[in-house]
């Protein structure tokens, strides 16, 4: 067990041109707060996926009012650290999302309004117990500077918070086979209480005799790496030989436990073990009250007058989630036309149009031939949002700039030989054939099939095709 700590140092305009407008004004003063979401491993999951390692919300920062004419400075920040307690081992690799939210303090009906100013995300390696790590992330024209660390809660120590320490029983040294607990030299490493043979690198225990595995390892002693392929066995405990984890319809699938709770199957259902500060059947209840303003995007908070009673956010249309933090997928209605790609930016829908189309919903079919010339006498043909050149004889390519090889398509039939010519092509027919493309057989008696050979040309002579 331990705590991930995040210290925000500054949030303001980044370097370079295009400084962002101040998020607050004299008419609409506002204040900032931050949300951090942690996930184990180097996952690149969507922002809406569960914060399996935990999440935290900062206090509100001081009220800020823009000074007219002044450039947007670094904005005043909330006091204190953001702390995300973790109950199990620290995974060592993790993904984070840090969101900067603006709370407008104008005269909105229904209380203050929240909007997301910036979201940064990253994937990092971090050992528990190490020094503060500094980071700078940019989101658009904004820049966020912050530090973070993971520290173990006593009696846990180590880079994963899996070793246990106890005060020394003797003042001078630790017991036989036990080392001093760095950095707590006045404490000793506790005797091993895990199941015999439990991997010291990939397993840990919180109760005597157990062996719980870190992410990516399985088996009774956490010695088998998890493989996600070649898993053909029925659902059940992971195979100690193949290390396969087979998804199936178990009560813990999809982790019904919210807020970083861990799920364990029971004979009849499931049970959530909640991180500190959360409780309820699915860890859905927290010590947060409506007074803390937990509902985002104009959600209405009901109940939760004290930390022991749950609050419920009634979300406005277009938002959902326990804190109205998730936007409904408006792009599923496919508002973009002509194959445009829909992007839900929160404040608006945007369409990224395919070539040849324009407009807010890609509704305008551009005149593809406007301003486009086809070379060498070609003519421009419009169609399907893409311009095409119909090229004059002897030319090809997108803009008719390439001299075509008229023989490339093997136009001479029946083994005739093709010769390129300035006016087109010429076929030299094999014996027994004639015609511009050697398409007509010559009858054995010398007569040919229609049409007759032109005067002055014998069968077998090269036929010029114009």
């Amino acid at each position: 067990a331990g705590v991930f700590e995040l210290q925000i140092h500054s949030f303001g305009p980044g370097p370079g041109p295009g400084a962002p407008r101040s998020p607050c004004s004299a008419r609409l003063p506002c204040r900032l707060f931050f949300r951090v979401c942690l996930k184990p491993g180097l996952s690149e999951e969507a922002a809406e996926s569960p914060c399996a390692l935990g999440a935290a919300l900062s206090a509100r920062g001081p009220v800020y009012t823009e000074q007219p004419g002044a450039p947007a400075p670094d904005l005043p920040l909330p006091d204190g650290l953001l702390q995300v307690p973790f109950r199990d081992a620290w995974p060592g690799t993790f993904s984070f999302i840090i969101e900067t939210w603006r709370e407008e303090l104008g005269d909105q009906i229904g209380g203050p309004a929240w909007s997301l100013l910036a979201r940064v995300a990253g994937r990092r390696r971090l050992a528990a117990g190490g020094p503060w790590a500094r980071d700078i992330q940019r989101a658009g024209a904004w820049e966020l500077r912050f530090s973070y660390r993971a520290r173990c809660e006593p009696p846990a120590v180590g880079t994963a918070c899996t070793r246990l320490c106890r005060p020394r029983s003797a003042p001078s040294r630790c017991g036989p086979g036990l080392r001093p607990c760095a950095p707590l030299e006045d404490e000793c490493e506790a005797p091993l209480v895990c199941r015999a043979g439990c991997s010291p690198e990939h397993g840990f225990c919180e109760q005597p005799g157990e062996c719980r595995c870190l992410e990516g390892w399985t088996g009774p002693l956490c010695t088998v790496p998890v493989s996600t392929s070649s898993c053909l066995s029925p659902r059940g405990p992971s195979s100690a030989t193949t290390g396969c984890l087979v998804p199936g319809p178990g009560p813990c699938d999809g982790n019904p436990c919210a807020n970083g709770g861990s799920c364990s199957e029971t004979p009849r259902s499931f049970e959530c073990t909640c991180p500190r500060g959360f409780y309820g059947l699915r860890c859905e209840v927290s010590g947060v009250t409506c007074a803390d303003g937990p509902c985002f995007n104009g959600g209405l908070c009901v109940g939760g007058a004290d930390p022991d009673s749950a609050y419920i956010c009634h979300c406005p249309p277009g938002f959902q989630g326990s804190n109205c933090e998730k936007r409904v997928d408006r792009c599923s209605l496919q508002p973009c036309r002509n194959g445009g790609l829909c992007l839900d930016l929160g404040h608006a829908l945007r369409c990224r149009c395919r070539a040849g189309f324009a407009g807010p919903r890609c509704e305008h079919d551009l005149d593809d031939c406007a301003g486009r010339a086809c070379a060498n006498g070609g003519t421009c043909v419009e169609g399907g949002g893409a311009h095409r050149c119909s090229c004059a004889l002897g030319f090809g390519g997108r803009d008719c700039r390439e001299r075509a090889d008229p023989c490339a398509a093997r136009p001479c039939a029946h083994g005739g030989r093709c010769y390129a010519h300035f006016s087109g092509l010429v076929c030299a027919c094999a014996p027994g054939y004639m015609g511009a493309r050697c398409e007509f057989p010559v009858h054995p008696d010398g007569a040919s099939a229609l049409p007759a050979a032109p005067p002055g040309l014998r069968p077998g002579d090269p036929q010029r095709y114009l």
Epitope: G318, P335, G340, L349, R361, C362
Partner: nanobody
């Protein structure tokens, strides 16, 4: 400002039918896309059926063959005919529309929702 007004929700037995209506009014130049979403208790909101920006119809897999969406362009109204209703169709049904306003801007609007309950 644009308003979407839903009607037609209610309680029905499994196998029964309901017809939802959604009328759009206000400073509308044109309706680009319009349809129905639903939000079952404790779950995410999802698209049920709609007319896309290209004018084609789109249905959720779970309602294909049972629900039919139709529209009356003159009245800026869409309808959702729901047949062979099941318990899992119980939800608040929301009308949604992507509208081009008189000032040529596009905005996405939601109705307030109408409750459909399917129970024996």
């Amino acid at each position: 400002e644009v308003q979407l007004v839903e009607s037609g929700g209610g309680e029905v037995q499994p196998g029964g039918s309901l017809r939802l209506s959604c009328a759009a009014s206000g400073s509308i130049f044109s309706i680009n896309a319009m349809g129905w979403y639903r939000q079952p208790p404790g779950k995410q909101r999802e698209l049920v059926a709609g007319f896309t920006g290209d004018g084609s119809t789109k249905y959720a897999e779970s309602v294909k063959g049972r629900f039919t969406i139709s529209r009356d362009n003159a009245k800026n109204t869409v309808y959702l005919q729901m047949s062979s209703l099941r318990a899992e169709d119980t939800a608040v049904y929301y009308c949604a529309a992507d509208v081009q306003l008189l000032n040529s801007d596009y905005e996405f609007y939601w109705g307030q929702g109408t409750l459909v309950t399917v129970k024996p």
